[in-house]
């Protein structure tokens, strides 16, 4: 039946109202038209709407959908971008730390290597930096370019301190020697297997949240389509066009509508979980050697080892590279290099009291788990967005796109619009490039995710424990093992706590006496720690 | 549309353990958390935890670990909260609320289930 | 834990007004905060989530706001439905915690 006459048969109330989302009055109607040009609002008898304010109000009603996509993942966005944020700071200054506990080792055990070692330690330690924040650079060159390098200083300065000055062109020969004659045993290895695991995840977690951005940013910026465009249009808007100003969309009707414009998005609902629980498999991994903040914060350890065993065989060493080095051509060795702010003052040595005790395993677990109430984040958006447009409630007395009803029939409605556009026809066109896009990579980082994550009781690879690991006593969950300095296996307990109770934020990047106490920003981030009982390096 | 309908009020004695539960119905259960809330008489809300029901992944305020013990069942979409040791400190009204999947905010609540601690 | 103040435990104003609950996180929470009403009946109702964004439902009379660690709710022509106890609640840092509540009553 014909739709009851506008209750204004001046157009009135449609002018007043759409003058607020158009100032001025040039494009209402008077009293009501024929409204022949209409396209979207097509009228079963006079209307107040012209082509002009059909075009205004699909700008609108795009405009509304791209607002309330925007609202719906406020949240969720702010939790990625926080998080993604909190742990590359928190990476870094991990990183930051591992350096100063090795640089402390040095100055501490080795002082006579200190000037050379601060250097070559730097620049092994900004090459991790750079690592996990996506460079191109392979971590067992990095390994073998700080072995390589320290080994020179320590043959000259700890194994053969008397060498004349005349001698000191060997460098070249000794970097050669280091690899040939496995100076540092198995050490160096162990770090790179260590190292490059650690990193290797640690860098895929980063890359993850970053993408976890970029998808929920794709889906934030989403541009409807013009068909789209047209059924909001006929849904939140052309009942004015009839007068019916405080008439509501039915319920059923909406949902309809949105499946249609929100077909593509839907479309990454599947991506987006499979995202989250491969996050969380990796996230299950990452302790032990897959754990950088457990494997960096104890290379130093490892590192002044390796040097021991250096010492433990300098005699033989010795003897050798005496006989391979000794025809290497004179050449003049660089003039070392010495830091402005090489010296540790004892004063930088500061007990941190922190209140919370937490690690960055425990902060990757919190943000999972706050990750899990976003899983059917897209699947939910079409409701939600229905939820947050006006409604009528129980589909009575609502507006199906074409007329006023009584009830909400969907087949009505689809038979009601077969001859404006074809419903079905707008979800099988497949979703937007850009969401093809977002969902290719999603795609691709689930791979990649899958292929880190490990079993989660898997112990340590087997060439690990070949390579002088322990793998006993490594089962529980609340001891965590890791590769030890001196009396063999470090028992961690609760992971890595990394600088509370006596956290010694030794910072030989400051300048002398300054010590930078990194504080918590906001308790968003308080990657500081008690070393537990792991051996630290200042003594 | 999302509901949650809780198991009846309880009389139960000192030392004794009770367990309530939370039906759910009108959204995939196994994909939201279930949290549990506490209410004293005349007070105000305590977070006991939380339940992902996909994977029973569990996360408790340390106040109630030891107290709470939070379960659920996909197959009927019902969370449980067992309470041991009981005594008159235990005696509230106890929500459970669903999580997500907009916000982590608690988006729906059940009616509350009273659990008095009498000898 | 992040302690959660409402300083108000009970406010009361005439219908028509505009009433502001407020709530004081003894931390930054980075606006994961929500408000909640709980009727006299016990029922319990979401009404604001992430500080601002009005849960599925909520009369546009409701809204939130936050300057650096307060917050507040804002009820503007209060009506006789909104008898009730209001609570804020900050999930930004585990255990979650909630305010104490503030009741507001009709004069």
């Known amino acids: 039946q014909p739709p009851p006459p506008p209750p204004d048969a001046t157009c009135h109330q449609v002018r007043s109202f759409f003058q607020r989302l158009q100032p001025g009055l040039k494009w209402v109607p008077e009293t009501p038209v024929p409204g022949s040009d209409l396209q979207v609002c097509l009228p079963k008898g006079p209307t107040c709407c012209s082509r002009k304010m059909e075009e205004k109000y699909q700008l609108t009603a795009r405009l509304n959908m791209e607002q309330l996509l925007q609202s719906a993942s406020m949240e969720l966005k702010f939790l990625i971008i926080q998080n993604a944020a909190v742990f590359q700071e928190a990476f870094e200054i991990v990183v930051r730390h591992a350096k100063n506990y090795t640089n402390a080792m040095f100055k501490n055990n080795y002082p006579s290597l200190t000037p050379q070692a601060f250097e070559f330690v730097g620049e092994f330690f900004t090459d991790v930096s750079l690592y996990i924040l996506g460079s191109d650079i392979n971590v067992d060159d990095m390994v073998n370019e700080l072995f390589d390098s320290l080994f020179p200083v320590i043959y000259t300065q700890l194994m053969n301190p008397g060498l004349p000055d005349s001698a000191l062109d060997i460098n070249e020969c000794l970097r050669g020697a280091r690899r040939d004659l496995k100076v540092f045993g198995n050490f160096p290895k162990l770090i790179m297997t260590q190292v490059s695991k650690s990193l290797q995840v640690t860098r895929i977690f980063l890359q993850a949240l970053n993408l976890g951005i970029e998808v929920i940013n794709t889906t934030d910026h989403l541009k409807f389509s013009k068909d789209c465009g047209r059924m909001l249009t006929r849904m939140w808007y052309c009942s004015y066009c009839q007068g019916l100003m405080m008439v509501k969309p039915c319920g059923g009707y909406c949902n309809v509508v949105m499946q249609g414009c929100m077909a593509g998005v839907v479309e990454i609902d599947k991506y987006w979980r499979e995202y989250i629980l491969s996050l969380e498999e990796l996230v299950n991994g990452m302790y032990r050697i897959y754990d950088m903040e457990n494997v960096l914060l104890g290379l130093f350890s490892t590192i002044h080892d390796s040097i021991q065993y250096v010492q433990k065989n300098a005699g033989k060493l010795t003897t050798t590279i005496g006989k391979l080095c000794a025809h290497s051509q004179q050449r003049q060795y660089r003039s070392a290099y010495y830091p402005e702010d090489l010296f540790i003052d004892k004063k930088v040595l500061k007990v941190a009291h922190v209140e919370h005790e937490e690690t960055l395993s425990s902060r990757r677990r919190e943000l999972i788990q706050k990750l899990k109430s976003f899983i059917s984040f897209y699947s939910a958006l079409p409701g939600y967005i229905c939820s947050h447009s006006p409604v009528a409630e129980n589909d009575t007395l609502c507006w199906n796109g074409q007329e006023l009803v009584e009830r909400y029939s969907q087949k009505a409605a689809r038979n009601g619009m077969k001859n404006q556009f074809n419903l079905h026809e707008l979800k099988m066109k497949g979703p937007e490039p850009v969401v093809s896009q977002i969902i290719d990579k999603l795609k691709h980082i689930n791979q990649l995710l899958r292929t880190m994550s490990m079993p989660k009781g898997r112990v340590l690879d087997k060439n690990l424990d070949e390579e002088g690991f322990e793998s006993g006593d490594c089962g529980d969950d609340e001891d965590e093992c890791i590769g030890g300095s001196g009396d063999g296996m470090i028992k961690v307990k609760n992971q890595l706590r990394f600088l509370a109770e006596l956290a010694y934020d030794l910072d030989v990047d400051d300048a002398p006496g300054n010590s930078q106490q990194a504080t918590p920003k906001d308790n968003e981030i308080s990657t500081f720690h008690n070393l537990g009982n792991v051996h630290s390096p200042l003594k | 549309q999302v509901q949650l309908q809780q198991s009846g009020p309880e009389l139960v004695k000192p030392g004794a353990s009770v367990k309530i539960s939370c039906k759910a119905s009108g959204y995939a259960f196994s994909n939201s958390w279930m949290n549990w809330v506490k209410q004293r008489p005349g007070k105000g809300l305590e977070w006991i935890g939380w339940i992902y029901p996909g994977d029973g992944d569990t996360n408790y305020n340390g106040k109630f670990k030891g107290k709470a013990t939070l379960a659920a069942d996909k197959s009927s979409s019902t969370a449980y909260m067992q309470l041991s040791s009981l005594t008159s400190e235990d005696s509230a009204v106890y929500f459970c609320?669903?999580?997500?999947?907009?916000?982590?905010?608690?988006?729906?609540w059940g009616q509350g289930t009273l659990v008095t601690v009498s000898a | 834990d992040i302690q959660m103040t409402q300083t108000t435990s009970s406010l009361s104003a005439s219908l028509g007004d505009r009433v502001t609950i407020s709530c004081s996180a003894s931390q930054g929470i980075s606006n994961y905060l929500s408000w909640y009403q709980q009727k006299p009946d016990g029922t319990v109702k979401l009404l604001i989530y992430y500080t601002s964004n009005l849960h599925s439902g909520v009369p546009s009379r409701f809204s939130g706001s936050e300057s650096g660690t307060d917050y507040s709710l804002t009820i503007t022509n209060l009506e006789p439905e909104d008898i009730a106890t209001y609570y804020c609640?900050?999930?930004?840092?585990?255990?979650?915690?909630f305010g104490g509540g503030t009741k507001l009553e009709i004069k």
């Open positions: 609320a669903r999580s997500g999947p907009i916000t982590m905010g608690f988006t729906y």
């Open positions: 609640q900050q999930y930004s840092k585990f255990p979650w915690t």
